[in-house]
Interface confidence: low
C-alpha cells in the first residue's frame, strides 16, 4: 500500500468517524436561505438566533483534519504515543510475570488424606428398635420409614441392633445369621439396606452374640462363639452391610486376637467396611491395648464419661488420648451404648455435642442424644433404652409427662433447640475440611475452659472454646501454646454459641472473650499466610 493511499485512508476515517468536527459553514448558509423564503417574522427572529448560535459553534469545532494530522505527527505526540504503548506492554508483561511468580511461589495445596465414609460425619446407634420406634412399631419395616429423619440429622451411618436370634444365655439358640422374627425378615432387612443406600446412609450391624443374656460372650464357650461371629461376618458382608459392631469386648477372652481376625475378614472383603468394638472400660491402658493390635478399628468406650465435667480434666483426657493414639483415627462418645443424659446434666448436653462434633475423629451418638432424651425424666423407662419421643403421643403411659419441647416434633420447630444445634453441627462437621480432617491443637484459655483449634491447609479455620464451669469466665487465649501454623487472629466470627442471645456472624475480639456458664463457642476465621 502506497503512502498516499495511507493518507487517503486516514482522511476517510476522519470523515467517517468524526463528522461533528467538519466545518459547519455550508449548513449555516442553507439555513439562512431557507429562512429568507419565510414570511413569518417570528420565525425570522428564531432563525437569527440559530444563526448566532451556529456562528458561535463554528468557533469551537476543534481541529480540522489537516491540523489534526499535523499535530498528531509532531515529535511530542509521537514520543507520547510510543511512551504509552511501551508502558502498556511493560504493564502487561509485568502482570504476566507477577502472575507466574504468584503461581510458582504460592504454597502447594496440602494433599487431602484418604477419607473413608465414617470419617465424614457422625454415626447413630439404634440399639433397641422397639424403643426407637415407639409402642408396637419396632421392626425393620418401620425403621425404613424413619430414614428421612436420619437424613435430616446428616449422620453418615446407622449402627443397628443386635437384631439376630438370641435366646438368653443359650449358645445353641443363638443364630447370628437369622433375624429375630420380632424385628422382621431377611427381606425386610434387604429392603432397609437398599433404602438406606439411596439416602447415602451406611448400615452397621451389631453382632454382639448374647445381647439378651448375662454375659454378652457366653464366657465359657468363647471358641464356639468366635466361629459363629466369623461365619456371620462373611454372611452379612455378602448381604451388603457396611460394617459391624461388637460390644462388651472386655468380657471376651483374648479380645485383641479375635478382633484382629474379624478385622482381617472385614477389610479383606473391602477396605470400605468398618469394624467397631465397644467396651465399658474407661481405662486408657486397656483401650490402647485393644487398639494396638487392630489398625483401623473404631473403638467406643467410657473413656470420656469420667471427665468430671471440668474443662481442665476433659482437656487432659482428650489430649492424652490423642497423644497416645497418634495418627490413628479416633471415635468420640461417652459410652459404647448409653445416652449422653446417663452421664451428663442437661446444662452440659449442648457443650458436649459441640465438643464431640469438633474433635478429630468420628462422633458416635445414641438415638435420642440429639433431643436430650432422658430416661430419668420418663417414669418406668429403662436407663439403657427409653422410648424415643417423636411427639407428645409417644409416651401415652402418663398423660402430660411429655412436653412438646422434649420431642422431635417440638424441637424441630424451635431453632434454638438441642436438635437444631445437633443438625447445624452435623452439617458443619460433614462439609468443612478443617472439621473433616483438620489438625487439632489444644491450648490454654484459663481454668475451667477447654479450647482448641481445628485447621486444614488454607481452608477456613475453627476455634472452639468450652466453659464447663457453672460461672461465667473470661477466656485468656494463650496463643503461645500454638504452633505458627495455627496462630490465632485478633478477631474471629461467631458461627454459633450453645447459649441463646449472641449475634451469630458477628466478629468477637479474642482477647476480650467472655463465656456464660456452660457455654460453648464455635468461631471461624480465615487462613492468613
Amino acid at each position: 500500500m502506497s503512502q498516499d493511499t495511507e493518507v487517503d485512508m486516514k482522511e476517510v476515517e476522519l470523515n467517517e468517524l468524526e463528522p461533528e468536527k467538519q466545518p459547519m459553514n455550508a449548513a449555516s448558509g442553507a439555513a439562512m436561505s431557507l429562512a429568507g423564503a419565510e414570511k413569518n417574522g417570528l420565525v425570522k427572529i428564531k432563525v437569527a438566533e440559530d444563526e448566532a448560535e451556529a456562528a458561535a459553534a463554528a468557533k469551537f469545532t476543534g481541529l480540522s483534519k489537516e491540523e489534526l494530522l499535523k499535530v498528531a505527527g509532531s515529535p511530542g505526540w509521537v514520543r507520547t504515543r510510543w511512551a504509552l504503548l511501551l508502558l502498556f506492554w511493560l504493564g502487561w508483561l509485568g502482570m504476566l510475570a507477577g502472575a507466574v511468580v504468584i503461581i510458582v511461589r504460592a504454597p502447594r495445596c496440602r494433599e487431602l488424606p484418604a477419607q473413608k465414609w465414617w470419617h465424614t460425619g457422625a454415626l447413630y446407634r439404634i440399639g433397641d428398635l422397639q424403643a426407637f420406634q415407639g409402642h408396637g412399631a419396632g421392626n425393620l419395616a418401620g425403621l425404613k420409614g424413619r430414614l428421612d429423619y436420619l437424613s435430616s440429622l446428616k449422620v453418615k451411618g446407622l449402627v443397628l441392633g443386635p437384631i439376630h436370634k438370641n435366646q438368653k444365655d443359650d449358645v445353641a439358640q443363638t443364630d447370628l445369621l437369622q433375624i429375630d422374627p420380632n424385628f422382621g425378615s431377611k427381606e425386610d432387612f434387604d429392603s432397609l439396606l437398599q433404602s438406606a443406600k439411596k439416602k447415602s446412609i451406611r448400615v452397621i450391624l451389631d453382632l454382639t452374640p448374647n445381647y439378651r443374656g448375662e454375659n454378652s460372650w457366653f464366657s465359657t464357650q468363647v471358641d464356639t462363639v468366635a466361629t459363629k461371629v466369623k461365619d456371620a461376618l462373611e454372611f452379612w458382608l455378602q448381604a451388603g452391610v457396611d460394617g459391624f459392631q461388637v460390644r462388651d469386648i472386655e468380657n471376651l477372652k483374648d479380645a485383641s486376637s479375635f478382633l484382629a481376625e474379624w478385622q482381617n475378614i472385614t477389610k479383606g472383603f473391602s477396605e470400605d467396611r468398618l469394624l467397631i468394638a465397644g467396651t465399658n472400660s474407661s481405662d486408657l491402658q486397656q483401650i490402647l491395648s485393644l487398639l494396638e493390635s487392630n489398625k483401623d478399628l473404631l473403638l467406643t468406650s467410657s473413656y470420656l464419661s469420667d471427665s468430671g465435667s471440668t474443662g481442665e480434666h476433659t482437656k487432659s483426657l482428650v489430649t492424652q488420648y490423642l497423644n497416645a493414639t497418634g495418627n490413628r483415627w479416633c471415635s468420640w462418645s461417652l459410652s459404647q451404648a448409653r445416652l449422653l443424659t446417663s452421664f451428663l446434666p442437661a446444662q452440659l448436653l449442648r457443650l458436649y455435642q459441640l465438643m464431640l462434633f469438633t474433635l478429630p475423629g468420628t462422633p458416635v451418638f445414641s438415638y435420642g442424644d440429639e433431643i436430650g432424651l432422658d430416661a430419668a425424666a420418663l417414669p418406668g423407662q429403662p436407663m439403657e433404652a427409653p422410648v424415643m419421643l417423636w411427639d407428645e403421643s409417644s409416651f401415652p403411659d402418663i398423660p402430660g409427662a411429655v412436653s412438646a419441647n422434649m420431642t422431635v416434633k417440638g424441637q424441630s420447630e424451635d431453632p434454638g433447640s438441642l436438635l437444631s444445634l445437633f443438625r447445624r453441627l452435623s452439617d458443619q462437621r460433614s462439609k468443612e475440611r478443617s472439621l473433616l480432617h483438620g489438625d487439632f491443637h489444644a491450648f490454654s484459655a484459663g481454668p475451667g475452659l477447654f479450647s482448641y483449634i481445628r485447621h486444614w491447609d488454607q481452608n477456613e479455620r475453627f476455634l472452639v472454646v468450652l466453659n464447663f464451669g457453672d460461672v461465667g469466665l473470661s477466656a485468656g487465649l494463650q496463643a503461645s501454646d500454638l504452633p505458627a501454623s495455627a496462630s490465632l487472629p485478633a478477631k474471629a466470627d461467631l458461627l454459633l454459641s450453645t447459649q441463646p442471645g449472641r449475634e451469630e456472624g458477628s466478629p468477637l475480639e479474642l482477647e476480650r472473650l467472655k463465656l456464660e456458664p456452660h457455654e460453648g463457642l464455635l468461631l471461624r476465621f480465615p487462613y492468613a499466610a
Partner: antibody, heavy 118, light 107 residues
Framework: QIQLVQSGPELKKPGETVKISCKAS????????MNWVKQAPGKGLKWMGW????????TYADDFKGRFAFSLETSASTASLQINNLKNEDTATYFC???????????WGQGTSVTVSS | DIQLTQSPSSLSASLGERVSLTCRAS??????LSWLQQKPDGTIKRLIY???TLDSGVPKRFSGSRSGSDYSLTISSLESEDFADYYC?????????FGGGTKVEIK
C-alpha cells in the same frame, strides 16, 4: 529400628543455661509422649515430667517447675530439655524416654551428662 | 505421690544363681509397673511392663510377678551381662516414680 539419640556431654558454670536435645528415629515422634528423667551421680532415677508430642503441651513434676523447659521440634523429630540459671545440684545425667501409657518408657536415650562447676 | 520401696538395695550373687528383687508400692497401682535395667555404661533398657509382660528381645530367664502390692523381678540363672542396676517404675499415676534401685554384683 527405634532410637533416641541425645546430644553430647556439657560442662557449664552456675547461672548459665544448657539445652539438651533428643532425636527420635524409627517412629513418628508425635505418636508417643516424651519423658525426661534425671539421675544425679551415684543416685537413682527421678522423673522430671513429659511433653505431649501431639499437642506440644508439657507437664512438669513439682521439683522441676520454674527453671526447666521441655520443647519440641516436630519437623526435626527432636525433643529438647533446657535448664536455666544452672545450679551445682543440676549436675546429673539426663535421659529422654518415650512413652505411651501401655508402653511407658520403653525406649531410652543414652543419657547426656551435665556438669555444673565454677 | 506413690512410693516404690525396692529391696534389697544391693546383692552379690554368682553366675547361674537364681535371684529375686522386690518392689513394694505404697498405693494400689493395678499392675502398672515396669522393670528397668541400667548397665554400668549408663544405658537403660526396659525388661518388663504391666508387672509380668516380657519386652521383646529380653531373655526368658527374666520374669515378673505380682502378689498384692508386692512386685518381683526374678532372674532364673544369672549370666555375666546381668550384673547391673535394676529399677522398678510405676505408671499408674502422675508423677511417675521409680524405686531406689537394686545393684546386682558378682560375688
Amino acid at each position: 529400628q527405634i532410637q533416641l539419640v541425645q546430644s553430647g556431654p556439657e560442662l557449664k558454670k552456675p547461672g548459665e543455661t544448657v539445652k539438651i536435645s533428643c532425636k527420635a528415629s524409627g517412629y513418628s515422634i508425635t505418636n508417643f509422649g516424651m519423658n525426661w528423667v534425671k539421675q544425679a551421680p551415684g543416685k537413682g532415677l527421678k522423673w522430671m515430667g513429659w511433653v505431649n508430642t501431639y499437642t506440644g503441651e508439657p507437664t512438669y513434676a513439682d521439683d522441676f517447675k520454674g527453671r526447666f523447659a521441655f520443647s519440641l521440634e516436630t519437623s526435626a523429630s527432636t525433643a529438647s530439655l533446657q535448664i536455666n540459671n544452672l545450679k551445682n545440684e543440676d549436675t546429673a545425667t539426663y535421659f529422654c524416654t518415650r512413652s505411651v501409657i501401655t508402653y511407658t518408657m520403653d525406649y531410652w536415650g543414652q543419657g547426656t551428662s551435665v556438669t555444673v562447676s565454677s | 505421690d506413690i512410693q516404690l520401696t525396692q529391696s534389697p538395695s544391693s546383692l552379690s550373687a554368682s553366675l547361674g544363681e537364681r535371684v529375686s528383687l522386690t518392689c513394694r508400692a505404697s498405693q494400689e497401682i493395678s499392675g502398672y509397673l515396669s522393670w528397668l535395667q541400667q548397665k554400668p555404661d549408663g544405658t537403660i533398657k526396659r525388661l518388663i511392663y504391666a508387672a509380668s509382660t516380657l519386652d521383646s528381645g529380653v531373655p526368658k530367664r527374666f520374669s515378673g510377678s505380682r502378689s498384692g502390692s508386692d512386685y518381683s523381678l526374678t532372674i532364673s540363672s544369672l549370666e555375666s551381662e546381668d550384673f547391673a542396676d535394676y529399677y522398678c517404675l510405676q505408671y499408674a499415676s502422675y508423677p511417675r516414680t521409680f524405686g531406689g534401685g537394686t545393684k546386682v554384683e558378682i560375688k
